[in-house]
Amino acid sequence: EITRTTLQSDQEEIDYDDTISVEMKKEDFDIYDEDENQSPRSFQKKTRHYFIAAVERLWDYGMSSSPHVLRNRAQSGSVPQFKKVVFQEFTDGSFTQPLYRGELNEHLGLLGPYIRAEVEDNIMVTFRNQASRPYSFYSSLISYEEDQRQGAEPRKNFVKPNETKTYFWKVQHHMAPTKDEFDCKAWAYFSDVDLEKDVHSGLIGPLLVCHTNTLNPAHGRQVTVQEFALFFTIFDETKSWYFTENMERNCRAPCNIQMEDPTFKENYRFHAINGYIMDTLPGLVMAQDQRIRWYLLSMGSNENIHSIHFSGHVFTVRKKEEYKMALYNLYPGVFETVEMLPSKAGIWRVECLIGEHLHAGMSTLFLVYSNKCQTPLGMASGHIRDFQITASGQYGQWAPKLARLHYSGSINAWSTKEPFSWIKVDLLAPMIIHGIKTQGARQKFSSLYISQFIIMYSLDGKKWQTYRGNSTGTLMVFFGNVDSSGIKHNIFNPPIIARYIRLHPTHYSIRSTLRMELMGCDLNSCSMPLGMESKAISDAQITASSYFTNMFATWSPSKARLHLQGRSNAWRPQVNNPKEWLQVDFQKTMKVTGVTTQGVKSLLTSMYVKEFLISSSQDGHQWTLFFQNGKVKVFQGNQDSFTPVVNSLDPPLLTRYLRIHPQSWVHQIALRMEVLGCEAQDLY
């Protein structure tokens, strides 16, 4: 029933291993409440084997993605790149296949991969030096037996280029958190040929030691907690092994730089978090009210004392008891573990509050999303327009623009018979994408659908990432449809943050054929329906300037609910003029980010509002019209009686009361609506 294709994208070839990772359905995997009790067999201690290489690569400290950088740095306008050396994880001892990090580890940036183990476990690290000079693998936890032998020579602490060395040690109790501390404790591993130069060159990574029975056997991590390691340090490129080479790259002859010039020195020092400056560290994405553990690391001289602050949030430290804190002082060589329950959705900042560091860019953003904010992004409704949907090709008239959930007709989907195909949606702005609903289509009497697919995504349309999510493989293979009409809802956990999303069929029936909807939200998790359609907003909360009634029907304000059915299923005013209004009282201040409007059809007559104004009030007495760019905004409403039209409010309104003022209409003023937004949050 299934035809199989290998993946090839339009912009690059993606290598991935053929192991299909089982889709994480709610019943299989739940990051919030997975039972971590393991069978008695799991008490047998294991050896955890990591394949890690020192690999040289170019690094720009996130400067190419930051709009602020060149303002602060005396550069020629081009972003400088620095050769660095990093710890890179590989799939096996052949060191040919690097391990793709995926969303959960994207935040590590320049850091090496997590090495995790429980007390009494053995850790085995096979280290290969793929760099051009000697490096080592070292952690203060490693006990070198030869050091204990009487009269032994000092250990040979370097591995030459293209050499491989295996390190093996047992995790002792003194390395682990005490019973009064959090489940896992952070250490670091690094290279110590020349500790200072090696770290400034980029060789450092997090090593986590956990209580017994903490790590999930399948995932090798604690699945009930989301973990983030943040390494605060000043990377000084003048102390890197590659300083001379980087100078030549970034300052081509004739180069007039004076080494002792303070401006030059500052331009080669990067106040970074995981090797990123100025809010550019990616991957700090977490769910509201989900337990988050931060491992805070610092290395270097005494200038690397940092005062860590998470805006809008407090965190806890645990030393016998738990203490709530808003600020943590981090000292060089100290690795601290703190936990947080992010209570407020939105985009927040983690930063070092010490002036010099903060000014130089030692801050980054973290995104807290609400799992409640999962609405259709507009494939079915048409809010996502035809031009936003493109594909590698199409079969006949089965065009990408038809790939809309529930679309009907004899040709009613995207379809292609080509292998290595893809379909792409441009959301026009970065969004949180929580999931995808897919459907096949019928041609004649046959069933065409995609049974397995992978997802790729991008913020800029150039650099693409393959979605890995919670998969234990190198990427997530999603199971799609089994017929032409059923809807399969696949959830992205963690969600995808992207402007562009691309679906690549890997297995299909007859031809790759798709109708779909994307489920998601804006980056602030603030475009949820506030309750008109669901009736969370009660009838009493909806009022109007007047309403039309006759012996057959009453078109009262409480009927102004999106998709309402019935004989009288909308609000209509008593008379049609621009002074009429419909009002919603949210009963508390809400953040309103959009309105969805819909007309109605009555006795074969289509009625709808073509243009409207919006006003808001905090007290129900004083009203302010919504302005944009210095003038009253006239919103473009409906063009028929049935299709919902979404209008965004930018900037959002913080209001208790909202009014819609119809300004032009077809036949009669008639309105069904939904308000989009979220609860207004106190900032502190």
């Epitope: 009497f445 046959s446 069933s447 007859i510």
Partner: antibody, heavy 120, light 107 residues
């Protein structure tokens, strides 16, 4: 190449019944709409019936409506034609055929046929 | 029902000739037309579907064209192996209907 193989044909008296089968040795049977087409000796082709991929939709030619029943068993990759109240005019070679849907793999769309002779 | 009228009912041509067979539908069938080749004692073989799409494995000397109600099968550079009866089929609406057939002989 994927093969469709019909069976169940033979000589039968008018008014009697016969059941034809068509087995698909390929992997895509459960996705395709399936047809029966017949050809009387020395005559042209005549479409008989169609069934959708899931068995929910069926259509028949007027000449067989009420007498013939098309069905399928996707678990067995098999298409059936139950023929009742046979008449001499039903004498023909019966072919099973797949919906004409283009894919990127070569499909055998027709079987080789099975002969049904209705004779007293 | 949609009637399919095929012409001519038979023709004779020499090897290397170009042969054209016409098929007319009693109403618009968009491009839902297929052409079959049948040799004596054999099952029909699909040549062309969706008016002009060549089935894989079919020589490129066969081509189809047309739209709405008028359709054509063209055989360029006729070969001895092309001696057969050719049928058109509309699969735009039920019941599906075939043309009466065109018998092609090689002189």
């Amino acid at each position: 190449e994927v093969q469709l193989v019909e069976s169940g044909g033979g000589v039968v008296q008018p008014g009697r019944s016969l059941r034809l089968s068509c087995v698909d040795s390929g992997l895509t049977f459960s996705s395709y709409g399936m047809h029966w087409v017949r050809q009387a000796p020395g005559a042209g082709l005549e479409w008989v019936a169609v069934i959708s991929y899931d068995g929910n939709d069926k259509y028949y030619a007027d000449s067989v409506k009420g007498r013939f029943a098309i069905s399928r068993d996707n678990a067995k990759n098999t298409l059936y034609l139950q023929m009742n109240s046979l008449t001499i005019e039903d004498t023909a070679v019966y072919y099973c055929a797949k919906d004409l849907i283009e894919s990127n793999i070569a499909e055998a769309f027709w079987g080789q046929g099975t002969l049904v002779t209705v004779s007293s | 029902d949609i009637q399919m009228t095929q012409s001519p009912s038979s023709l004779s041509a020499s090897v290397g000739d170009t042969v054209t067979i016409a098929c007319r539908a009693s109403r618009d069938i968009r491009n839902d037309l297929a052409w079959y080749q049948q040799k004596p004692g054999k099952a029909p073989k699909l040549l062309i579907y969706a008016t002009s799409r060549l089935q894989s494995g079919v020589p490129s000397r066969f081509s189809g064209s047309g739209s709405f109600t008028d359709f054509t099968l063209t055989i360029n550079s006729l070969q001895p192996d092309d001696s057969a009866t050719y049928y058109c089929l509309q699969d735009s609406d039920y019941p599906l209907t075939f043309g009466g057939g065109t018998k092609v002989d090689i002189k």
